[in-house]
């Protein structure tokens, strides 16, 4: 999701320089995050790209990646998850929607959830 | 006790170089991002420029971009500011300052005291 | 750019009484649930002082007497009760756009 959209930010030749200057210190801050599972609307990927550039940036200028593998975990169980829920549920989403998929960046029209699934209990 | 101690201002003419200088001392120098804020005759604050704490990522204000250079020396907790092709409007007290984060909100929590750059012919 | 607009450019507070100084952004400082809005202090002679950061947060070493609020493009420094060492000129910063822009300044003197 967070290479899909602004590419101004330049996430991912920025996130390689990061892990390569951190290397020796960070093993796993190379490993691209897997976000396959997710898809979110357009809005939501503007969200999620704007979030981690002000991660970037602020790691950049304390040159210090320890936070990110927590990062990306708290973007993949909880973020990721609010947004796709808030992206296929009202109001939101009415009847069907355009999600982009997190990995490949590509649109696919879908139907919105449920109301059962999306206000359990309701 | 947390200090900046600052040199190398001066009068120069339009055109001219002058390299400003920061000696940091009671914290991990290499720990912090710095930066430098000017204020003009008028008593107007302006960013200028930041570096990261290992001295790999550099920002400049567009003003400056192309004439200043920003550096660091971390074995001597010392930060730099390389400035050339001077204009009338470079005119300013120079301060270096320490860039901090709360969360994720930026600020100058430590400052140096200051040292005055003029630029006349 | 963000522009930094404070109000007023000087007042005068009586010593023991509120003295209250606005910013105005020209678009909001906020993101996700942070104001990245800060506040600092100058003496003559002196270089700026951090008195404030986050909109709301006392930096380490300064008087209760100071606090911050506000969201989104409005905030407010106050100073109650002020101090004969309060009388200095003020100044608000934005972080959450490149580049930090500073507001021009708020002069406070003390009756």
């Known amino acids: 999701c967070v290479f899909c959209r602004l590419p101004a930010h330049d996430l991912s030749g920025r996130l390689a320089r990061l892990c390569s200057q951190m290397e020796a210190r960070q093993k796993e801050c190379g490993a691209s995050p897997d976000f396959s599972a997710f898809a979110l609307d357009e809005v939501s990927m503007n969200k999620v790209t704007e979030k981690t550039h002000r991660v970037l940036r602020v790691m950049e200028i304390k040159e210090a990646v320890s936070s990110l593998p927590s990062y990306w975990s708290w973007l993949r169980k909880t973020k990721l998850p609010e947004y796709t829920r808030e992206a296929l549920c009202p109001p939101a989403c009415r009847g069907s929607t355009t999600l982009y998929n997190c990995s490949t960046c590509k649109g696919t029209e879908v139907s919105c959830w449920p109301r059962k699934r999306c206000f359990p209990g309701s | 006790e947390v200090k900046l101690q600052q040199s190398g201002g001066g009068l120069v003419k339009p055109g001219g170089s002058l390299k400003l200088s920061c000696a940091a001392s009671?914290?991990?120098?290499?720990?912090?991002?710095m930066s430098w804020v000017r204020q003009t005759p008028e008593k107007r604050l302006e960013w200028v420029a930041t570096?990261?704490?290992?001295?790999?990522?550099?920002y400049y204000t567009d003003s400056v971009k192309g004439r200043f250079t920003i550096s660091r020396d971390n074995a001597k907790n010392t930060l730099y500011l390389q400035m050339s092709s001077l204009r009338s409007e470079d005119t300013a007290m120079y301060y270096c300052?320490?860039?901090?984060?709360?969360?994720?909100?930026?600020?100058?929590?430590?400052w140096g005291a200051g040292t005055t750059v003029t630029v006349s012919s | 750019d963000i522009v930094m607009t404070q109000s007023p450019a000087s007042l005068a507070v009586s010593l023991g009484q509120r003295a209250t100084i606005s910013c105005k952004a020209s678009?909001?400082?906020?993101?996700?649930?942070?104001?990245?809005m800060n506040w600092y202090q100058q003496k003559p002679g002196q270089p700026p002082k951090l008195l404030i950061y986050?909109?709301?947060n006392l930096e380490s070493g300064i008087p209760a007497r100071f606090s911050g609020s506000g969201s989104g493009t409005d905030f407010t420094l106050n100073i109650h009760p002020v101090e004969e060492e309060d009388a200095a000129t003020y100044y608000c910063q934005q972080s959450n756009e490149d580049p930090w822009t500073f507001g021009g300044g708020t002069k406070l003197e003390i009756k």
């Open positions: 570096i990261s704490s290992g001295g790999s990522y550099t």
């Open positions: 986050a909109a709301s």
């Open positions: 678009q909001s400082v906020d993101y996700d649930g942070d104001s990245y």
């Open positions: 009671g914290f991990t120098f290499s720990s912090y991002a």
């Open positions: 300052a320490r860039h901090n984060y709360g969360n994720y909100v930026g600020y100058f929590d430590v």
